[in-house]
């Protein structure tokens, strides 16, 4: 007779990433007896919630429950019923909600309150919904990619310390691009972090890490576009904005009220003699790049070195994983290969932006026009941000790795967040005995 397989002794966790443009739910799974080992937690499912980000529900909070239903029901189906009550659920909201809170703390609280009530109705162990800080977002993204890459996995054997990765223990830096903010996080080489706000100290698996992180609010790709439009319309002679960041032949009407809705455009706000204006694409990479650079104030730096807007940035060090919108945009543009040089990326962006809108629509018939129309801007913005904002060079460009998933888990802050909240990253190195090591998978 065949041996019956023992029931899997696994645990689950759920994290909802409430971003500025949409919400995603991630289910994580790990063997119960190995929760303090590195690299054992993996993403078993993901669900993208239909609709916009939660901050857009400010005038219709009663719809939040329905909005979350499909993905929460999918989670209920995906996790065995016997595990429901001990499965923690966390919701972390990022820059979209940070911006809403800047406008009105009361409105942000109301949205979160309804989210919490909705999530409490499910049979899981709901642990709360909160707006995470930009610093947390950067730090948890850094933890996620390094955890998945096995960078923390210097296993202590019962008889000696044998690194699994002999020459490759340097951590990766993390570059995260969202709709409303962007984060840069890495371990600088023998460099004092001059600004205390940007310094983090971690002790993970027995090793100390001095980490630099900064989150640039309003510099996610969507808010950067709003900033650029608000800046450029200031000097437009009429209600037509000839825009180099959109394809030739592209036309779109923008309401001035929408433009000034976000706190990110406040610095460019002025009384305009029209209620709406029309974007007319002219598709010129170089001019688009120049326009984007005007969003980065590099004239002032109170430190030895800055990124932009007076924010300290140490010299870049080592390899970087660029994920979220960095990856999605570059993947669409077919520019994620490590060997595509920065010069080649620039060249390809010039050609892409110059393509007529009608041609682009035909070539990418399956892509929603709203997204399709913005790839020229987004690609140019990514190049501008990395090269002029963060000071990557043609040489260091080759150390940027555009990453979607690692070992089947999305690169992003959610896994790191859950690992931290479930205390699954020990400060000290867990000692493995001969028996537990022999059963290692």
């Amino acid at each position: 007779t065949q041996n019956k397989a023992l029931p899997e002794n696994v645990k689950y966790g759920i994290v909802l990433d409430a971003g500025s443009s949409h919400t995603s739910l991630y289910i994580y799974k790990w063997p119960a007896e190995k929760e303090n080992d590195t690299g054992v937690v993996h993403q078993s499912a993901e669900c993208r919630v239909k609709g916009p980000g939660i901050s857009k529900f400010v005038q219709k909070v009663n719809e939040i429950g329905i909005y979350l239903t499909d993905c929460m029901e999918a989670a209920r189906e995906a996790i065995p019923r016997s595990q429901h009550q001990e499965t923690p659920v966390y919701l972390g909201a990022t820059a979209g909600m940070r911006l809403l809170r800047m406008e009105s703390e009361e409105l942000a609280d109301r949205v979160l309150d309804v989210v919490e009530r909705s999530l409490s109705n499910y049979p899981f162990d709901f642990q709360g919904a909160r707006i995470i800080t930009g610093q947390e977002e950067g730090a948890y993204g850094w933890i996620t990619i390094n955890y998945l890459l096995g960078k923390f996995s210097q296993k202590t054997r019962w008889f000696s310390i044998v690194p699994y990765e002999t020459n490759n223990q340097e951590t990766f830096g993390a570059l995260d691009l969202g709709g409303a903010s962007t984060q840069v996080t890495f371990v600088p080489q023998n460099q004092t972090i001059e600004s205390p706000d940007n310094a983090l100290q971690f002790r993970l698996y027995g090793k100390d890490y001095n980490v630099y992180t900064h989150s640039f609010l309003c510099y996610g790709k969507d808010q950067a576009l709003w900033q650029k439009l608000a800046k450029d319309i200031q000097v437009a002679s009429n209600e037509i904005l000839r825009d180099p960041c959109f394809h030739p032949g592209y036309k779109k009407v923008v309401n001035v009220s929408d433009l000034y809705k976000t706190p990110c455009t406040k610095r460019f706000e002025m009384t305009l003699p029209f209620q709406q204006f029309e974007i007319q694409g002219i598709g010129n990479y170089q001019q688009c790049h120049q326009s984007i650079l005007e969003l980065f104030n590099t004239s002032y730096c109170p430190y030895s070195q800055c990124a932009f807007n007076g924010i300290f940035l140490p010299p870049l060090q080592g390899d970087f994983g660029a994920f979220s919108a960095f990856y999605f945009v570059m993947k669409f543009l077919n520019l994620t290969s490590e060997k595509v040089s920065q010069e080649k990326v620039t060249e390809m962006m010039k050609k892409f932006c110059a393509q007529p809108w009608e041609e682009i629509k035909t070539s990418y018939a399956g892509v929603k026009e709203k997204y399709l129309s913005e790839y020229c801007f987004s690609g140019t913005y990514i190049l501008s941000l990395l090269l002029q904002g963060y000071h990557f060079t043609a040489d260091s460009w080759e150390h940027i790795h555009f990453i979607g998933k690692i070992q089947g888990s999305d690169a992003g802050w959610t896994l790191g967040y859950m690992l931290n909240l479930t205390n699954m990253i020990p400060a000290e190195q867990p000692l493995s005995t001969p028996l537990s090591h022999s059963t290692y998978v």
Epitope: Q43, T166, N167, N168, D319, K339, V340, K405, Q407, G408
Partner: antibody, heavy 118, light 108 residues
Framework: PVQLQQPGAEVVMPGASVKLSCKAS????????MNWMRQRPGQGLEWIGE????????NSNQRFKGKATLTVDKSSSTAYMQLSSLTSEDSAVYFC???????????WGTGTSVTVSS | EIVLTQSPTTMTSSPGEKITFTCSAS???????LHWYQQKPGFSPKLLIY???NLASGVPTRFSGSGSGTSYSLTIGTMEAEDVATYYC?????????FGGGTKLEIK
């Protein structure tokens, strides 16, 4: 266990087409790229192309453009490669393999032996 | 495309010996993109080492990898009879992904 199952063999006529399958199990199919490789008798490995099952995005080796078409069926967690206008040169073992960051192939199918013969 | 050259094409060794396979790339590769596989006759290839130096799951610790730039190597600390196979390096750094021609390890 994570597995990629492929049919053992296919015999096809010259000029015809064949659609090879690769059924994934034991993991979330849409979370990893699927790659295809060719190995001619007594030869080394050649990469044909890759597909991301989450959005059907593909990259392929120029050498196989017009020869190989990659598709997936998410509902059955199966990847397919259609080979067209077959000649004796296409007689080989074709492997599917799961890809991860760094573009290494951590799980391989058992391989399908394709023989082009009249 | 990046061409990977493996040498030697064939090597003969005795159990207990230390063996090193080399893989030379036609242009520099970031170490995160160089991997090694073992293929036994009639079987599918099996991942041994990924990202230059990381041991794949279930692979004996006698296997190790190192290298950077254009020069990479795979070492078997103490050869065993079951290691008779062909060993391939592979790069994922650029499209198309490419494999080395392989080194066939035979037993003395």
């Amino acid at each position: 266990p994570v597995q990629l199952q492929q049919p053992g063999a296919e015999v096809v006529m010259p000029g015809a087409s064949v659609k090879l399958s690769c059924k994934a199990s034991g993991y979330t199919f849409t979370s990893f790229w699927m790659n295809w490789m060719r190995q001619r008798p007594g030869q080394g490995l050649e990469w044909i192309g890759e597909i991301d099952p989450s959005d059907f995005y593909t990259n392929s080796n120029q050498r196989f453009k017009g020869k190989a078409t990659l598709t997936v069926d998410k509902s059955s967690s199966t990847a397919y490669m259609q080979l067209s206008s077959l000649t004796s040169e296409d007689s080989a073992v074709y492997f599917c393999a799961r890809g991860d960051f760094g573009w290494y192939f951590d799980v391989w199918g058992t391989g399908t032996s394709v023989t082009v013969s009249s | 495309e990046i061409v990977l050259t493996q040498s030697p094409t064939t090597m003969t060794s005795s159990p207990g010996e230390k063996i090193t396979f080399t893989c030379s790339a036609s242009s520099s590769i970031n170490s995160n993109y160089l991997h090694w596989y073992q293929q036994k006759p009639g079987f599918s290839p099996k991942l041994l080492i990924y990202r230059t130096s990381n041991l794949a799951s279930g692979v004996p610790t006698r296997f190790s990898g190192s290298g950077s730039g254009t020069s990479y190597s795979l070492t078997i600390g103490t050869m065993e009879a079951e290691d008779v196979a062909t060993y391939y390096c592979q790069q994922g750094s650029s499209l198309p992904r490419t494999f080395g021609g392989g080194t066939k390890l035979e037993i003395k």
